[in-house]
Amino acid sequence: MVPPPENVRMNSVNFKNILQWESPAFAKGNLTFTAQYLSYRIFQDKCMNTTLTECDFSSLSKYGDHTLRVRAEFADEHSDWVNITFCPVDDTIIGPPGMQVEVLADSLHMRFLAPKIENEYETWTMKNVYNSWTYNVQYWKNGTDEKFQITPQYDFEVLRNLEPWTTYCVQVRGFLPDRNKAGEWSEPVCEQTTHDETVPS
């Protein structure tokens, strides 16, 4: 009896959909695996007789529920199928946006770049897919614990009237208000303000 794959899960970030599993202990030899997806009542092979423990399902539609399954094989024997269901538009992880930060005197000027849909070669982004897409920004004085959050209206934001000659750190994430779903935070970017531009009277 061939044991089934273990810990079967979907690892999906920005619609790069990778089904992953672990090979079970099997004394007779090395196992291979076949992974399939359900397409209009029929299961279609995606990865056949692979020695890998993952399979790329990124070509699946972003919309609707998909049934995926994987089994282990040895010679002419095979395990039972292990099934999972997956809805990319609901389940994919929203990766961190890009961010450009520029210091102008006592202000930080930020521009945000929505993460690209990973499995495509054009410039579609996660913002295209999700109508309610917005950004959350958090910033803080470097070395302090207090963080401030804002929700920019656009793909850019300016933090004004900051303390001069002070290092501020900023990070951004995508947020979907209609789904109450937050993406991953970008790595903090820390920049030092310069002088206060106000002219003394």
Partner: nanobody, 126 residues
Framework: QVQLQESGGGSVQAGGSLRLSCAAS????????MGWFRQAPGKEREGVAT???????NYADSVKGRFTISKDNAKNTLYLQMNSLKPEDTGMYYC????????????????????WGQGTQVTVSS
């Protein structure tokens, strides 16, 4: 909400031609992958022709040289020109769309398209 509406089906003699159209609302054809699928009675739905946002096309072997897929982005309409029709081309023809898709992966199965029209019937008699 994306909506697709096919038209242009009908009955034709073998060797004849038909042109199917698929009009979209809530979606722009320039932003994704489109396809024509068909389903004969008692059979599974199968891919006939697909077109990516960059205009690149793919055809099922059974229709190569006879069918042509195209799109008019300005009219937001997808077409399937079917020439030299055969009785085995008979079936319900469906238009399918997958928004924000560029063809980074070849898409050829039902599960790879998220939105579907209601279909238009094509009948080819000998």
């Amino acid at each position: 909400q994306v909506q697709l509406q096919e038209s242009g089906g009908g009955s034709v003699q073998a060797g004849g031609s038909l042109r199917l159209s698929c009009a979209a609302s809530g979606y722009t054809y320039s932003s994704g992958c489109m396809g024509w699928f068909r389903q004969a009675p008692g059979k599974e739905r199968e891919g006939v022709a697909t077109i990516n946002s960059d205009g690149s096309t793919n055809y099922a072997d059974s229709v190569k040289g006879r069918f042509t897929i195209s799109k008019d982005n300005a009219k937001n309409t997808l077409y399937l020109q079917m020439n030299s029709l055969k009785p085995e081309d008979t079936g319900m023809y469906y238009c399918a769309a997958e928004p924000y898709c560029s063809g980074g992966y070849p898409r050829w199965s039902v599960a790879e398209f998220g939105y579907w029209g209601q279909g238009t019937q094509v009948t080819v008699s000998s």
